[in-house]
């Protein structure tokens, strides 16, 4: 499955929007940084099928969408930027869903890669728990924003590797 050229442009736009969402200086939040234990092994160049990689990417973007579409995120972040961000993520999800259909031919395919998807879900659960424990403070959101930018970058790298293997 060929992801459209607009997909990688959308990725870049999403990263830029995340960068623009910064509300405070990250240097005032150094003590709030946290290791969320990003499931790196799910994004490494292991010999998994392309369909599995697409499913993991889909889950990553879906969870990112969920995280940023809560009422707490709307209160903490710029709504105009958030709206643009949702549009980009929605497009990413559509592209990846089309790909999953082409690769596997069944919409339920993510169930075949439960362990990988569970690892991504647990990662986002840790992020949500951190935000809750920090009472959704501005520093907590800044730490999470940086974390999502980092994980999003790793997702983009995986997509690039998939493309180069075609």
């Amino acid at each position: 499955c060929d992801l459209p050229q607009t997909h990688s442009l959308g990725n870049r736009r999403a990263l830029i929007l995340l960068a623009q969402m910064r509300r405070i200086s990250p240097f005032s939040c150094l003590k709030d940084r946290h290791d969320f234990e990003f499931p790196q092994e799910e994004f490494d160049d292991k010999q998994f099928q392309k369909a599995q990689a697409i499913s993991v990417l889909h889950e990553m973007i879906q969870q990112t969408f969920n995280l940023f579409s809560t009422k707490d995120s709307s209160a903490a972040l710029d709504e105009t930027l958030l709206d643009e961000f949702y549009i980009e993520l929605d497009q990413q999800l559509n592209d990846l869903e089309s790909c999953v259909m082409q690769e596997v031919g069944v919409i339920e395919s993510p169930l075949m890669y439960e362990d990988s998807i569970l690892a991504v879900r647990k990662y986002f659960q840790r992020i949500t728990l951190y935000l809750t424990e920090k009472k959704y403070s501005s520093c907590a959101w800044e730490v999470v924003r940086a974390e999502i930018m980092r994980s999003f970058s790793l997702s983009i790298n995986l997509q690039k590797r998939l493309k180069s293997k075609e």
Partner: antibody, heavy 120, light 111 residues
């Protein structure tokens, strides 16, 4: 590919000011913090401060707060550092360097350095 | 400011042997699972090059003979087996709090 091109060698008098530049290419200049680092001849490295070109936010090492001023012009993809009230202690090589890994604050790409010599 | 003390100031290691460089921080640079200590290599007349980030993560493109370890205040850079091209000065850098500081450097010579 990512490149940081710094301005050439500068010779200045004590008490004067100098402004050096760092032109970035090969990446999104506005979305990466840019650090500045000082290295005196035969000595170690000192962190001066950092600027976010996207909106001009700066954070300084207190030691350099009254010495260095960081700015950026996004239309030119260029970061600048101005050093004022120069003394012999300011004679050094100054590097601009791109922030890496977001809030880990490491530095991946470095400019070739601008040599500043302060002499009367 | 957090002071980073590197030792030794210089060392000479035979080709193929192990080089061990230590960096001690005057205060912990670890928090919530991450150790904010990084290592750079600087060859004469060149700019520093990132080798290791967050104490033990190998930067992309850096040979696997480089490894980092440690947490809290004590960190180590190991090079094994040492190769000719590893002759350089090595610096640790922390980003645990402001201001970020570097160690004074360790000069590695290959025998």
């Amino acid at each position: 590919q990512v490149q940081l091109q710094e301005s050439g060698t500068v010779l200045a008098r004590p008490g004067a000011s100098v402004k050096m530049s760092c032109k970035a290419s090969g990446y999104s200049f506005t979305t990466y913090w840019m650090h500045w680092v000082k290295q005196r001849p035969g000595q170690g490295l000192e962190w001066i401060g950092v600027i976010y070109p996207g909106n001009g936010d700066t954070t300084y090492n207190q030691k350099f707060k009254d010495k260095a001023k960081l700015t950026a012009v996004t239309s030119a993809n260029t970061a600048y550092m101005e050093l004022s009230s120069l003394t012999n202690e300011d004679s050094a090589v100054y590097f601009c360097t791109r922030n890496y890994k977001y809030d880990y604050y490491t530095m991946d790409y470095w400019g070739q350095g601008t040599t500043v010599t302060v002499s009367s | 400011d957090i002071v980073l003390t590197q030792s030794p100031a210089s060392l000479a290691v035979s080709l193929g042997q192990r080089a061990t460089i230590s960096c001690r921080a005057s205060k912990s640079v670890s928090t919530s699972g991450h150790s904010y200590m990084h290592w750079y290599q600087q060859k004469p007349g060149q700019t520093p090059k990132l080798l290791i980030y967050l104490a033990s993560n190998l930067e992309s493109g850096v040979p696997a003979r480089f490894s980092g370890s440690g947490s809290g205040t004590d960190f180590t850079l190991n090079i094994h087996p040492v190769e000719e091209e590893d002759a350089a000065t090595y610096y640790c850098q922390h980003s645990g709090e402001l201001p970020f500081t570097f160690g004074s450097g360790t000069k590695l010579e290959i025998k």
